[in-house]
């Protein structure tokens, strides 16, 4: 269903002060400037729709230029509780507290929010990424240590008149950026509390949020250059499908990944790429300006629509799933990494997908909207697309029901 509802105050139009408030690049995440404490301490914070904690570096670390100094904030309150977040690779741990938080290039409000002060971490901060913390924008169900810790966005909506919605436009550069270029580059926009029409073209199409934990959606069909992968649609969502700005790649369940790679290989068979390319290990390069985009297929994901038996599709180009990488050894060429990878935790629609689209996280109406991004990288022959409606039956059957256990869910 397209975006044809009556206007609601504060939900539409122009949000000039928030446009271009993100920096970064797909490989190391997109970050927004935030201030914490009194007097305000400025930090760059990774925007992550795949987690639900607001957590910031609060102790010296070799990869951090600055960190949150609680002792300097007159408004800091200690919750006298620790938090430990293990990942499949790495972890962070810290101490919970609350403090006053605002977003300089966001809504003109200050909120008291929960903050995890990271005191120890392993494989969490990234050297050269330029961010010092993470803003988990997903739901309380996956917050650590448990769902009683209110996430930042919930606090924001509760304490202010900001509508319960945010939207993201992540702008991939289309070429590798060195450190100084990243610091100077525009990475996109996080519009808090609304939708900015200047950031997209065409119509917004919405898919239901299946369950409010991650931003879980249902994929009902996958096509490579218009060719259906013809898999049981449950496979596409095994064990879930999520929209995650904190992940670089489009990650697919093993069976789906293998089928997709087989199909992409077949479509691009005019060139013989090494096995290591499909694994994300080897780069492929072409002389500057000669990348044969046309030999690579487009990839379409059909998402459940808002109306029964109706779906819509989002289509990305190789310009989204081939990620430019700078390598001094081959600096005279344009080199790329294959940015689709295998997952054991379901489909993750990371930056590779999001860089093609303006994505609306309409929490108030439990839905996610997609429109073609005004900043997506394309060529003169093809463009990313959001199209519908399509008739698709039995879409509810595409969702996988995860067996309930007491074990923690957030092992990314």
């Amino acid at each position: 269903e397209t975006d044809e509802e009556p206007e609601e105050p504060g939900r539409r139009g122009s949000f000039v002060e928030m446009v271009d408030n993100l920096r970064g690049k797909s490989g190391q995440g997109y970050y927004v400037e935030m201030t914490v404490g009194s007097p305000p301490q400025t930090l760059n914070i990774l925007v992550d729709t795949g987690s639900s904690n607001f957590a910031v570096g609060a102790a010296p670390h070799p990869f951090l230029h600055r960190y949150y100094q609680r002792q300097l904030s007159s408004t800091y309150r200690d919750l006298r509780k620790g938090v430990y977040v293990p990942y499949t690779q790495g972890k962070w741990e810290g101490e919970l507290g609350t403090d006053l938080v605002s977003i300089p290039h966001g809504p003109n409000v200050t909120v008291r929010a929960n903050i995890a002060a990271i005191t120890e971490s392993d494989k969490f901060f990234i050297n050269g990424s330029n961010w010092e913390g993470i803003l988990g924008l997903a739901y309380a169900e996956i917050a650590r240590p448990d769902d009683s810790l209110e996430p930042f966005f919930d606090s924001l909506v509760k304490q202010t008149h900001v509508p319960n919605l945010f939207s993201l436009q992540l702008c991939g550069a289309g070429f590798p950026l060195n450190q100084s270029e990243v610091l100077a580059s525009v990475g996109g926009s996080m519009i808090i509390g609304g939708i900015d029409h200047s950031l997209y073209t065409g119509s917004l199409w919405y898919t239901p949020i299946r369950r409010e934990w991650y931003y879980e959606v249902i994929i009902v069909r996958v096509e490579i250059n218009g060719q259906d992968l013809k898999m049981d649609c449950k496979e596409y969502n095994y064990d879930k499908s999520i929209v995650d700005s904190g992940t670089t790649n489009l990650r697919l369940p093993k069976k789906v990944f293998e089928a997709a790679v087989k199909s992409i290989k077949a479509a691009s068979s005019t060139e013989k790429f090494p096995d290591g390319f499909w694994l994300g290990e080897q780069l492929v390069c072409w002389q500057a300006g000669t990348t044969p985009w046309n030999i690579f297929p487009v990839i379409s994901l059909y998402l459940m629509g808002e109306v029964t038996n109706q779906s819509f599709r989002i289509t990305i180009l190789p310009q989204q799933y081939l990620r430019p990488v700078e390598d001094v050894a081959t600096s005279q060429d344009d080199c790329y990494k294959f940015a689709i990878s295998q997952s054991s935790t379901g489909t993750v629609m990371g930056a590779v997908i999001m860089e093609g689209f303006y994505v609306v996280f309409d929490r108030a109406r439990k839905r996610i909207g997609f429109a073609v991004s005004a900043c997506h990288v394309h060529d003169e022959f093809r463009t990313a697309a959001v199209e519908g409606p399509f008739v698709t039956l039995d879409m509810e059957d595409c969702g996988y029901n995860i067996p309930q256990t007491d074990e923690s869910t957030l092992m990314t």
Epitope: G27, Q28, T88, Q89, I126, N127, G128, E271, K272, F273, P274, D275, G276, G280, E281, Q282, L283, V284, C285, D327, V328, A329, T330, C335
Partner: antibody
Framework: EVQLQQSGPELVKPGASVKLSCKAS?????NFWIHWLKQRPGQGLEW???????????KYNQKFKAKATLTVDTSSSTTYMHLSSLTSEDSAVYYC?????????WGQRTLVTVSA | DIVMTQSQKFMSTSVGDRVSITCKAS??????VAWYQQKPGQSPKALIY???YRYSGVPDRFTGSGSGTDFTLTISNVQSEDLAEYFC?????????FGGGTKLEIK
């Protein structure tokens, strides 16, 4: 400037194990996989395996699966190779190399000598 | 595993000459072949990738050619510093494999 700094020479007894290191600098460590290779006089170069520093995913040459274990520490941009149950056949020069297209960058070599 | 064969173990040449070193793959590897130079006591140095592309900083007297199963590294106007062993490598499929090497001797 991209550099791969390998640990120094090792003299080890048969049956023992050894852990070699390779510290990377001059590039974004998590962007490129690290490979390990073996060279013995008259036997050419052999690829042992590789590791992705972004998630510690490993892939090994079947021939070295029971011999080598690769690990990574992103906080120090260092990759390690643990060689177990050493025999005289493991006496060799070992290299780490960084991927890109093939292996554009190599470490300076580590000589391992297995001797009683 | 793909076998990379460098049939000439040694080649003798003179300064200023042109020399071609060959390498044969046991199966089609497309253009996914690299060439390395190794001087005694040193690590290999990358010269050529994708069969014919020079890495940054490699002198243009080194050229690579070939595709499929047959590959050649040509050094034109050989210099005394080119005295070294040269290896080909396929990175088309795992496990990555190398040729046995060709030692270039300067007369």
């Amino acid at each position: 400037e991209v550099q791969l700094q390998q640990s120094g020479p090792e003299l080890v007894k048969p049956g023992a194990s050894v852990k070699l290191s390779c510290k990377a600098s001059g590039y974004t460590f998590t962007n490129f996989w690290i490979h390990w290779l073996k060279q013995r006089p008259g036997q050419g170069l052999e690829w042992i395996g590789m590791i992705d520093p972004s998630d510690s995913y490993t892939k090994y040459n079947q021939k070295f699966k029971a011999k080598a274990t690769l690990t990574v520490d992103t906080s120090s941009s260092t990759t390690y190779m643990h060689l177990s149950s050493l025999t005289s056949e493991d006496s060799a020069v070992y290299y780490c190399a960084r991927s890109g297209v093939a292996f554009p960058y190599w470490g300076q070599r580590t000589l391992v000598t297995v001797s009683a | 595993d793909i076998v990379m064969t460098q049939s000439q173990k040694f080649m003798s040449t003179s300064v200023g000459d042109r020399v071609s070193i060959t390498c044969k793959a046991s199966q089609n590897v497309g253009t996914n072949v690299a060439w390395y130079q190794q001087k005694p006591g040193q690590s290999p140095k990358a010269l050529i990738y994708s069969a014919s592309y020079r890495y940054s900083g490699v002198p243009d007297r080194f050229t690579g050619s070939g595709s499929g199963t047959d590959f050649t590294l040509t050094i034109s106007n050989v210099q005394s510093e080119d005295l070294a062993e040269y290896f080909c490598q396929q990175y088309n499929s795992y496990p990555y494999t190398f040729g046995g090497g060709t030692k270039l001797e300067i007369k």
